[in-house]
């Protein structure tokens, strides 16, 4: 629940650099927390909600350790460009429900699309190679109702959250190592 | 009612390790990080590390990495810190605090375990 | 690692008083619009308690009376009329960077 961040200023610095993708993170990742605070207010999520076209989570136990900074800028990116994906899908398929949402949404899109150029940005800075997804993009259908629309936006807000907060930390983890 | 829970105070001896728990309730486990405060007599509050319990994935302040272990058992909504090769200047009061997923500011604190080595 | 240096150390006022307790950090932890700066109060044998955070935000259920200001490496919170139940210590944190590390503390005691 912070004010919005301020354009970064463009630097030849890695950790300037990387300071300006982790405000960018940060200020998305309070976005984030925000509207999916906003979604269980006006449509309360029972348990956990999951979405099997949306990326594994890229953290688990030990893994934060040995993190090296080419493996989280381009797997972020990948992760990113899939929530980009969905956020957009459910612009489009979300249906009336989603409609009231609209303009947060829209919001947190250009916000992902601006740290998604930021990541690029910092990617060719380093000369690291501007990786395509593993997987390939498997097209999405529309809602099979409008509960279902409504889970998919849990879904997709929660992970996008927890993947917003495993870039933080990694990102700031990686700072203290430069 | 949001609350952090943890162990009582344990005496230990030089070398030995210490494992505090901390049981949150009241809140959905996995919404914030679980981070570890450590406040020694007369010295500056000093943060250990943090661990999202949703994925597992800690990390450390550089000064406890390699003595300090984090871990969570998500379906009890508890959180352990285990401190290894103790000495005499880990003789301190331990919180668990609930931290904001990107912000590392503490809004639920446990009541704190006191922990002291002596010989 | 940011150092956060608080001033005065201590400081006896009476209730009804205001307070300006400050957190000076070795350098900047604000940027763009956010300030990583966050306070809490400690009463002897118990827990911090988060008061503000991100410089000025007061946590819920905390008095109107407590506020947070400051950008850069100057940050102030204030307590325009003090109470009973305010005599205690005041930490300032910053979250800018990795590790997050606290101030000395500042403690008010009743004068």
């Known amino acids: 629940p912070g004010p919005p961040a301020g354009s970064p200023r463009v630097s030849s610095d890695p950790r300037a650099d990387l300071d300006s993708a982790v405000l960018l993170t940060r200020s998305l990742l309070a976005d984030t927390r925000q509207l999916a605070a906003q979604m269980r207010d006006k449509f309360p999520a029972d348990g956990d909600h999951s979405l099997d076209s949306l990326p594994t989570l890229a953290m688990s136990a030990g893994t934060l350790g040995s993190l090296q900074l080419p493996g989280v800028l381009t797997r972020l990116r990948v992760d990113l460009m899939s929530y980009l994906r969905h956020v957009q899908w459910l612009r489009r398929a979300g249906g009336p429900s989603l409609k009231t949402l609209e303009p947060e949404l829209g919001a947190l899109q250009a916000r992902l699309e601006r740290l998604l150029r930021r990541l690029q940005l910092l990617m060719s800075r380093l000369a690291l190679p501007q990786a395509a997804p593993d997987q390939p993009v498997i097209p999405l259908g529309p809602p099979a109702s409008a509960w279902g629309s409504i889970r998919a936006a849990h879904a997709i807000l929660g992970g996008l959250h927890l993947t917003l907060d495993w870039a933080v930390r990694g990102l700031l983890l990686l700072k203290t190592r430069l | 009612e949001v609350q952090l829970v943890q162990s009582g105070a344990e005496v230990k001896k030089p070398g030995a390790s210490v494992k505090i728990s901390c049981k949150a309730s009241g809140y959905t486990f996995t919404d914030y990080n679980m981070d570890w405060v450590k406040q020694a007599p007369g010295q500056r509050l000093e943060w250990i590390g943090d661990?999202?319990?949703?994925?597992?994935?800690?990390i450390y302040n550089q000064k406890f990495t390699g003595r300090a272990t984090l871990t969570v058992d998500k379906s009890a909504s508890t959180a352990y810190m285990e401190l290894s090769s103790l000495r005499s200047e880990d003789t301190a009061v331990y919180y668990c605090?609930?931290?904001?997923?990107?912000?590392?500011?503490?809004?639920?604190w446990g009541q704190g375990t006191t922990v002291t080595v002596s010989s | 690692d940011i150092v956060l240096t608080q001033s005065p150390a201590s400081l006896a006022l009476s209730p009804g008083e205001r307070a300006t307790l400050s957190c000076r950090a070795s350098k900047s932890v604000s940027t763009s619009g956010y300030s990583y700066i966050h306070w809490y109060q400690q009463k002897p044998g118990q827990a911090p308690r988060l008061l503000i955070y991100?410089?000025?935000n007061l946590d819920s259920g905390v008095p109107a009376r407590f506020s947070g200001s400051g950008s850069g490496t100057d940050f102030t919170l204030t307590i325009s009329s003090l109470e009973e139940e305010d005599f205690a210590t005041y930490y300032c944190q910053h979250s800018r960077d990795l590790p997050p590390t606290f101030g000395q503390g500042t403690k008010l005691e009743i004068k």
């Open positions: 661990i999202n319990p949703h994925q597992g994935g800690p």
């Open positions: 605090a609930r931290g904001e997923l990107g912000h590392w500011y503490f809004d639920v």
């Open positions: 991100l410089a000025s």
